[in-house]
């Protein structure tokens, strides 16, 4: 019996087609992805093949103005239109709190939404009961397939699930659910979830009875043969893991942003054992037509976005200096504003010992592309912020050793004075440079804001200590020459859309007046 699994993950609000790098589509003839194009390909495959499941491994939420405006309603609407069969909850599905998941998505989705390792307690337990499930048994042709969901147990540090959801260890939570499916005579089981490729492989290895793992969170690109675009494969598709009980378990992921549609064909024997598996992600490039009816629907929904872009988010009573002349040479108040917003967006009081789990922000000055003049009645719009942060990036959470941070700050000024983008703006950090010293030895003082303290204060950076830092995904990926971050980071979790982070902060503060306050000094 053959099953075709079509899968997406980490779509992050890319409902419209995008450029090759998943930013805003500029030249339509070169654009990719988007739900209209995805629908075309899904329908083609459904037409051609008998037993097809369309699955999503989480993080549909967050990433573009679509999510900012529609807050998940767009996800439910278009996933329903594409007739998804199941979805796993990702960490970003909790970005607007549990209510922001329940109302727009859980109550509106016409497909099951899954996670076996999230347990509700207290008053939420009855409110959310039945709205998401640990597993679902789906009829596929003449057979049944069990889908069991999982979500990163780090979600409380990455999003806003509140205090009434407990995120258990994935493997511990999955095993009893898989066992239950077995007792129900379900012998073909897919683990669908959002914990990253390393956990996907562990699940394949450790959870008895799981036949296939369809994952997300780490934006992993797997491919067999010559890859069709810029993404470099982390391994073959599918990635085969030998389980502890000796089975070959295919593990797949399909990069991110709706650029690819994962396509996996699995052959099962009559006892539900995987005999063979093959496939590849399908690049959704512009040679795949956008479905006209879905496209028309997208255009209808788009109207509200254009209106939103010009509405006032808040006011500034000071000039927001985002000029290259400032942000690439010294502390600039636009950099301070953005870093403050980044920290504010990551306030998660998850432990009595810590006032927060993260206190530090770094931001490449070259990523700040425009100032905002306060003389326009102080008005700040999404449109203004899009000029400041035009690249459609995210502000991510990483864990780094102090020694890596020191290298990053040395890199920040290694060729100071040439208006290069690597000069770092900061939050929760006090740095002093001595430019008379040779490159690689210019950081004379580096103090960081404590987290394990009731009264935050600045302490000298410790080389061997592991620190959490919020930074643009561009830096996490080694951009602007920050190879040391990419090479030495100990953990990397994708965060929220950059503009969304700053816009939310401005809306919250209502009136802003960021200052230049001595975060960066030169001796």
């Amino acid at each position: 019996w053959e099953l075709t699994i079509l899968h997406t993950n980490d779509v992050h609000s890319r409902l419209e087609q995008t450029s090759e790098d998943s930013s805003k589509c500029v030249n339509a003839s070169r654009c990719m992805g988007g739900v209209a194009r995805l629908f075309t390909k899904v329908q083609q495959i459904r037409r051609a093949e008998p037993n097809v499941l369309l699955l999503d491994a989480g993080d549909q939420y967050q990433g573009t103005i679509w999510f900012t405006v529609y807050k998940g309603a767009e996800v439910a609407h278009f996933m329903n239109a594409l007739r998804y069969d199941a979805m796993a909850l990702g960490n970003h599905e909790f970005d607007n709190g549990v209510e922001g998941l329940i109302e727009p998505l859980l109550k509106e989705a016409k497909f099951p939404i899954l996670s076996a390792n999230i347990k509700a307690k207290g008053p939420l337990a009855s409110q959310i009961s039945g709205l998401y499930l640990p597993y679902k048994v789906l009829p596929v042709g003449d057979e049944v397939v069990g889908i069991v969901g999982y979500t990163s147990k780090e979600t409380p540090f990455l999003s806003n699930p509140g205090t009434n959801l407990v995120f258990e260890d994935e493997i511990t939570a999955l095993q009893p659910e898989v066992d239950k499916l077995k007792t129900l005579n379900v012998n073909k089981i897919i683990a669908l979830g959002h914990s990253g490729f390393e956990m996907d492989k562990l699940i394949a290895q450790k959870v008895r009875g799981v036949d296939v793992v369809v994952g997300g969170h780490s934006n992993t690109f797997l491919y067999t043969g010559n890859p069709p675009s810029k993404e470099v494969p982390a391994g073959k598709y599918p990635f085969i893991v030998t389980s502890d009980d000796g089975r070959k378990v295919p593990v797949v992921q399909a990069y991110a942003f709706g650029k690819y549609l994962g396509y996996l064909k699995i052959e099962f024997d009559e006892r539900g054992n995987v005999i063979s598996s093959h496939g590849n992600p399908i690049l959704l490039n512009s040679s795949i037509p956008e479905d006209p009816s879905i496209k028309a629907d997208i255009n209808k929904w788009r109207i509200k976005l254009d209106n939103y872009s010009t509405q006032e988010l808040g006011k500034t009573i000071v000039y927001l200096d985002g000029s290259s002349q400032s942000c690439r040479f010294r502390e600039c108040n636009m950099g301070n504003l953005i870093c403050d917003a980044m920290i504010n967006n990551n306030l998660r009081h998850t432990d009595e010992m810590f006032w927060n789990h993260v206190s530090m922000c770094i931001l490449n000055g070259g990523g700040i592309r425009s100032p905002i003049d306060e003389r326009n009645n102080g008005t700040i719009t999404w449109e203004n912020l899009a000029a400041v942060l035009p690249f459609g990036g995210t502000f991510d959470l990483v864990q780094l050793k102090g020694s890596t941070l020191k290298k990053a700050f040395e890199h920040s000024v290694h060729r100071y004075g040439q208006s290069t983008g690597e000069f770092l703006q900061v939050g929760g950090i006090h740095v002093v440079y001595d430019l008379s010293r040779k490159p690689g030895d210019r950081v004379v003082k580096l103090d960081v804001l404590c987290t394990k303290c009731r009264v935050p204060s600045y302490d000298p950076l410790k080389m061997d200590e592991v620190y959490k830092v919020i930074l643009p995904n561009f830096l996490a990926n080694g951009g602007d020459g920050f190879q040391m971050i990419k090479d030495e980071l100990l953990r990397h979790d994708s965060g929220d859309q950059d503009i969304n982070v700053v816009s939310t902060y401005i809306s919250k503060m209502k009136v802003i007046y960021p200052a230049v306050e001595g975060r960066i000094k030169f001796s």
Partner: antibody, heavy 121, light 107 residues
Framework: QVQLVQSGAEVKKPGSSVKVSCKAS????????LSWVRQAPGQGLEWMGE????????YYNEKFKGRVTITADESTSTAYMELSSLRSEDTAVYYC??????????????WGAGTTVTVSS | DIVMTQSPDSLAVSLGERATINCKAS??????VAWYQQKPGQPPKLLIY???YRYSGVPDRFSGSGSGTDFTLTISSLQAEDVAVYYC?????????FGGGTKLEIK
């Protein structure tokens, strides 16, 4: 290389049936769709229907109202098109053509050489 | 059924000159349009798929454009071997339908 080799010309009486074959080679037969397209003398092209050999799923042009049946034999990588209740206006060249539904070439990328079917009393 | 209306029915162009063939769909077919070249006694040959993508091995003097309902095949500099009948076809909805064809000749 990809080849679609069709059976030879046929002369048929009105009311009878014809079965044309199309043997595929040079690619994985079950991973592509196969369509049948006909062309009456001096006329344009007309799509009759298609089959996806991997699933056996078939789709037909309503115009042929149950007269056409498309089948596929995986073991020999051969597709067949049977047209029944033949009439003189069914005189045409019948082509099989491959369709890459997993790829991005929206069109028929390989064609058979065609089979001439003449319907005459 | 989606009707594909091709124009002109026939076209005579001098060698080295540009030839343009149009195709209009009766409803929005996105970019799901292919163009074929057919010479006497031969099966059609795929030239352009998805409205504007040149099929492998097709000379770059052939180009396609359009989306929605209006599509164009252009031969930038006509060669003697381009004499043939050209067909557009929509691949958006079954039954897949072809235009009536355009006979291209040398003037």
């Amino acid at each position: 290389q990809v080849q679609l080799v069709q059976s030879g010309a046929e002369v048929k009486k009105p009311g009878s049936s014809v079965k044309v074959s199309c043997k595929a080679s040079g690619y994985t037969f079950t991973s592509y769709g196969l369509s049948w397209v006909r062309q009456a003398p001096g006329q344009g092209l007309e799509w009759m229907g298609e089959i996806y050999p991997g699933s056996g799923n078939t789709y037909y042009n309503e115009k042929f109202k149950g007269r056409v049946t498309i089948t596929a034999d995986e073991s020999t990588s051969t597709a067949y098109m049977e047209l029944s209740s033949l009439r003189s206006e069914d005189t045409a060249v019948y082509y099989c053509a491959r369709y890459d539904y997993l790829g991005s070439s929206y069109g028929f990328d390989y064609w058979g050489a065609g089979t001439t079917v003449t319907v005459s009393s | 059924d989606i009707v594909m209306t091709q124009s002109p029915d026939s076209l005579a162009v001098s060698l080295g000159e540009r030839a343009t063939i149009n195709c209009k769909a009766s409803q929005d077919v996105s970019t799901a349009v292919a163009w074929y070249q057919q010479k006497p006694g031969q099966p059609p040959k795929l030239l352009i798929y998805s409205a504007s993508y040149r099929y492998s091995g097709v000379p770059d003097r052939f180009s396609g454009s359009g989306s929605g309902t209006d599509f164009t095949l252009t031969i930038s500099s006509l060669q003697a071997e381009d004499v043939a009948v050209y067909y557009c076809q929509q691949h958006y909805n079954t039954p897949y339908t072809f235009g009536g064809g355009t006979k291209l000749e040398i003037k």
